[in-house]
């Protein structure tokens, strides 16, 4: 399968820009925004500080940490309403993320 | 509107102690951690310290001991400062620490002076 | 102990021009990536304006880009603007647990001409 020029392959994701016009699905992580190809009952998410394609059940129940969102070695948790995550790094230093 | 402001910033005199308070707004404390930086006049920032929700304080090495940064309340970080010497004048701030240090406070001045 | 130097301390620009501030630290920033750079007008606070080494912060012109991973990075800033004259620092963050948890460049000051 050829992919045209700015053709994503299924199933993966790339960073672009805020005043990018793009008609691909997208989800703000921190203040970047992904455009991504996914598969079926699949959603733009997170992986690993990284956007990702990710079960769109995850993205529905608003269970972020099963994304596994966070570093390696890094530990996650659900902010109090599901409004995000946070992940904490060794040594207890916190990197928020929130989904609008 | 998420916002900072510190408060407590006061001329002393060399071996006194102060508390600086940063109060935050439009965020909640427990979901975030927070900095505390300082620069002398004319010169460039230096970071102090930073707090998360639960955890102990971590220090830059030169501040262990002097200085003790502590939450407060729901909505206040506290940094408390000992023995102040001269070198110690500056303009204190506090940023939330997340993805960079977005927002600052304004800063609060401490002129240590004989 | 942890050290950011930048460089080069003070450098000009004509107005168009394209600016280069490198920053470099003693040992890896956490995650390879986590560096943050920073605008500051005199009685101001600090501005930031990138995150992440590359992310360009809410509100920050894309005239400013950042680059660069590990130890090494660089802020260029091209179609120099008048309002651009400010002193700008790069801030590294490392792991809590083995060292400070974060430190900062010396600051690059920017002159218009």
């Known amino acids: 399968q050829f992919l045209k020029e700015g053709q994503l392959a299924a199933g993966t994701c790339e960073i672009v820009t805020l005043d990018r016009d793009s008609s691909q699905p997208r989800r703000t992580i921190a203040r970047q925004t992904a455009r991504c190809a996914c598969r079926k009952g699949q959603i733009a998410g997170t992986t690993r500080n990284k956007p990702s394609c990710v079960d769109a059940r995850i993205i529905k129940t608003k269970q972020w940490c099963d994304m596994l969102p966070c570093l390696e070695g890094e530990g996650c948790d659900l902010l109090i309403n599901r409004s995000g995550w946070t992940c904490t790094q060794p040594g207890g230093r916190i990197k928020t993320t929130t989904v609008s | 509107q998420e916002q900072l402001v510190e408060s407590g910033g006061r001329l002393v005199t060399p071996g006194t102690t102060l508390t600086l308070t940063c109060t935050v707004s439009?965020?909640?404390?427990?979901?975030?951690?927070v900095s505390w930086v300082r620069q002398a006049p004319g010169k460039g920032l230096e970071w102090i310290g930073y707090?998360?929700?639960?955890?102990?304080p971590h220090y830059a090495s030169w501040a262990k001991g002097r200085f003790t940064i502590s939450k407060t309340s729901s909505t206040t970080v506290d940094l408390k400062m000992t023995s102040l010497t001269t070198e110690d004048t500056a303009t204190y701030f506090c940023?939330?620490?997340?993805?960079?240090?977005?927002?600052w406070g304004p800063g609060t001045l401490v002129t240590v002076s004989s | 102990e942890l050290d950011l130097t930048q460089t080069p301390s003070s450098v000009s620009a004509a107005v168009g021009g394209t600016v280069t501030i490198n920053c470099q630290a003693s040992q890896s920033v956490y995650n390879n990536k986590n560096l943050a750079w920073y605008q500051q007008k005199p009685g101001q606070p600090p501005k930031l304006l990138i995150y992440a080494a590359s992310t360009l912060a809410s509100g920050v012109s894309s005239r400013f880009k950042g680059s660069g991973s590990g130890t090494q990075f660089t802020l260029t800033i091209s179609d120099v603007q008048c309002d651009d004259a400010a002193t700008y620092y790069c801030q590294g963050e490392f792991s809590c647990s083995s060292a400070d948890c974060n430190a900062f460049g010396g600051g690059t000051e920017l002159e218009i001409l």
């Open positions: 707090i998360a929700n639960n955890y102990n």
């Open positions: 439009g965020f909640s404390l427990s979901s975030y951690g």
């Open positions: 940023a939330r620490d997340n993805y960079g240090m977005d927002p």
